[in-house]
């Protein structure tokens, strides 16, 4: 037989076995010009020493073969002995290692069999009523097709599905959408209405995420507040990655799960912007404020469930950093300025009350004064920190107040509001004899002692009413008792106590008169 012709003899090898896992697959035959035809196929398994034979049976009942050698593509003309106007059956037999493997057959009319392409280019994926909708441009000059899809998950084999007939410039397919696992889809096409025409190759994989993005399972830790008033939020546990089908591993556009970090700064509510969304990979620095943090997972079908944490405020205080002066016009705070053109947010709330009751004030951008200090003033009429109670004050700073992640904590401290010097005056001063020349003075703790770091010291004053001599005794803020010694019997004394803050001298308590009685010996 001539190589260009189909040989009408028995093939030169024994009968075939189509049951093995390897062998020829996916035979496609079609007309490529007015008088030429091509068949191509795939071979699965080791290719060394394999000879392929394209078999053909005609409507007349006669059968022939083309010897293709090691090639998996063969062209022939309409003069090769194969009738192209009538139905024929074609298949491939591959002879290797003393056995023959056989492909599935195709039965078709070669003249009317056109080479169809799979969907090419961009396949758009969307969700429609709980199903997956795929849409693509029909390949040029190929309107009118039957379309099939196959799909698999990471744990299941390929399943075949039908898209139905297509007859437009764009083609589409409705496919099943999995709730919780990613899928790989491939599509193929063949000529519509041409009995037995060959299927195209399978398209490139279309990777589809589950309808529900996986819930993020992550953990955070927050570092200590640094010298710059910022602390780093770090991810302790990465979100679990979605398991992907074989063809989607590596680069799988479409299945990506995006994890976003949503920050909500709870402190300083008077600032312009309270929330910011970031990519999870870019972990931010935070001020010492309280935050709510949410991790939101989303894929091409939208957001999924989120996971939320509360990051409490950093309560480390620096009692010396803030200077407060109270004048007739009002109160002014001074603190070391951060930099040029900084906006400050001053937040205060009564101690022991819910964080929701915080009040704040935003300064206009300000430069440091000649002493390198930043200031904030308010009048008595404003009512700010006007009540005689303990307030917790935090000052935040930012050169870009509209950017949530650029705030830093300048300081946190306590302040006693209202007329602190009067309100802090110790009450219930009492004097008890201690010895022949000494007394013990006790008093109730000043209201200032409820405010950590505010009470600097107590001062106890003793006045000799005879000589008008005065002595003053400083007492630690944690103590509410002192022993006065070196006193003389029979002399009248008055004692007073005051409570001082770092910036304010207290008001003396009411004078308390006492004397040590003269001891008369029997």
């Amino acid at each position: 037989c001539r190589t260009s012709e189909c040989c009408f003899q028995d093939p030169p090898y024994p009968d075939a076995d189509s049951g093995s896992a390897s062998g020829p697959r996916d035979l496609r035959c079609y007309r490529i010009s007015s008088d030429r035809y091509e068949c191509s196929w795939q071979y699965e398994g080791p290719t060394a020493g394999v000879s392929h034979f394209l078999r053909c049976c005609l409507s007349s009942g006669r059968c022939c073969y083309f010897a293709a050698g090691s090639a998996t593509r063969l062209q022939f003309s309409d003069q090769a002995g194969v009738s192209v106007l009538y139905t024929v059956t074609l298949w491939v037999e591959s002879w290797a290692r003393n056995q023959t493997e056989k492909s599935p057959e195709v039965t078709l009319q070669l003249y009317n069999s056109v080479k169809y392409e799979p969907p090419l280019g961009d396949i758009k994926v969307s969700k429609l009523a709980g199903q997956l909708r795929m849409e693509w441009e029909t390949p040029d000059n190929q309107v009118g097709a039957e379309v099939q899809f196959r799909h698999r998950t990471p744990s299941s084999p390929w399943k075949l599905g039908d898209c139905g007939p297509q007859d437009d410039d764009t083609e589409s397919c409705l496919c099943p959408l999995e709730m919780n696992v990613a899928q790989e889809f491939q599509l193929r096409r063949r000529q519509l209405g041409s009995q037995g025409s060959s299927w195209s190759k399978w398209s490139s994989p279309v990777c589809v995420p589950p309808e529900n993005p996986p819930q993020p399972q992550v953990r955070f830790s927050v570092e200590q507040l640094g010298q710059d008033g910022r602390r780093r939020l770090t991810l302790k546990e990465q979100p679990t990655q979605l398991e992907l089908p074989e063809g989607c591993q590596g680069l799988a556009p479409g299945t990506e799960v995006t994890y976003r970090l949503q920050l909500h700064m709870l402190s300083c509510p008077c600032k312009a912007k309270a929330t910011r969304t970031l990519h999870l990979g870019k972990m931010p620095y935070l001020s010492g404020a309280a935050y709510n943090v949410a991790v939101i997972s989303s894929n091409q079908f939208g957001p999924g469930l989120n996971q939320t944490w509360h990051i409490p405020a950093d309560t480390h205080t620096e009692p010396v950093a803030l200077n407060i002066s109270v004048g007739t016009n009002g109160t002014t705070m001074y603190w070391p300025a951060r930099a040029q053109s900084m906006t400050y947010c001053i937040e205060w709330q009564p101690v022991g009350q819910d964080g929701g009751l915080a009040t704040c004030s935003l300064t206009a951008p300000q430069d440091p004064d000649p002493a390198g200090m930043a200031t904030y003033s308010w009048s008595r009429e404003s009512g700010a920190m006007g009540q005689e109670k303990c307030y917790y004050i935090t000052i935040f700073a930012s050169a870009h107040p509209e950017k949530l992640t650029l705030w830093s904590t300048v300081l946190s401290t306590y302040h006693f509001g209202g007329n602190a010097s009067a309100a802090g005056t110790p009450h219930h001063v009492s004097v008890k004899n201690h010895s022949l020349d000494s007394v013990s003075v006790d008093w109730a703790p000043s209201l200032l002692s409820t405010c950590p770091g505010v009470l600097k010291e107590y001062v106890v004053r003793c006045r000799d009413e005879d000589s008008k001599q005065v002595s003053e005794h400083p007492v630690q803020p944690t103590e509410t008792q002192v022993t006065l010694s070196g006193l003389r019997a029979g002399v009248a004394y008055t004692v007073q106590v005051r409570a001082d803050t770092a910036w304010l001298r207290g008001v003396w308590s009411q004078p308390q008169r006492f004397s040590i009685e003269v001891q008369v010996s029997d």
Partner: nanobody
């Protein structure tokens, strides 16, 4: 060598159904096309239906189209012919035949043949 054994024939009323089976001895049977033929006394053997080794291609004589269905189970080395809406004219001995080629029409020479099974349809 492939040996074929038919079964499932019998007597049935017109309009009834029968299912014929063709079992093969050889493991290589899953790479063979199989056809059913029938013959009545004094007449030539007549093609009924054929199926390819993959099961992807089937072919029927015009007289049985829509009534008969050919199928195969390669795991069991068996081919079936489901015959519904039987008519007295379907009475014949039914033969199963196998070949390494699949013929796209009623014509074709088959290498291996069974002994046949009798189907009788009463009016």
């Amino acid at each position: 060598q492939v040996q074929l054994v038919e079964s499932g024939g019998g007597l049935v009323q017109a309009g009834g159904s029968l299912r014929l089976s063709c079992a093969a001895s050889a493991r290589i049977f899953n790479s063979y096309a199989v056809a059913w033929f029938r013959q009545t006394p004094g007449k030539e053997r007549e093609f009924v239906a054929s199926i390819s080794w993959s099961g992807g291609s089937t072919n029927y004589a015009d007289s049985v189209k829509g009534r008969f269905t050919i199928s195969r189970d390669n795991a069991k080395n068996t081919v079936f012919l489901q015959m519904n809406s039987l008519k007295p004219a379907d009475t014949a001995v039914y033969y199963c035949a196998a070949d390494r080629n699949y013929y796209p029409s009623v014509l074709g020479k088959y290498t291996y043949w069974g002994q046949g099974t009798q189907v009788t349809v009463e009016p």
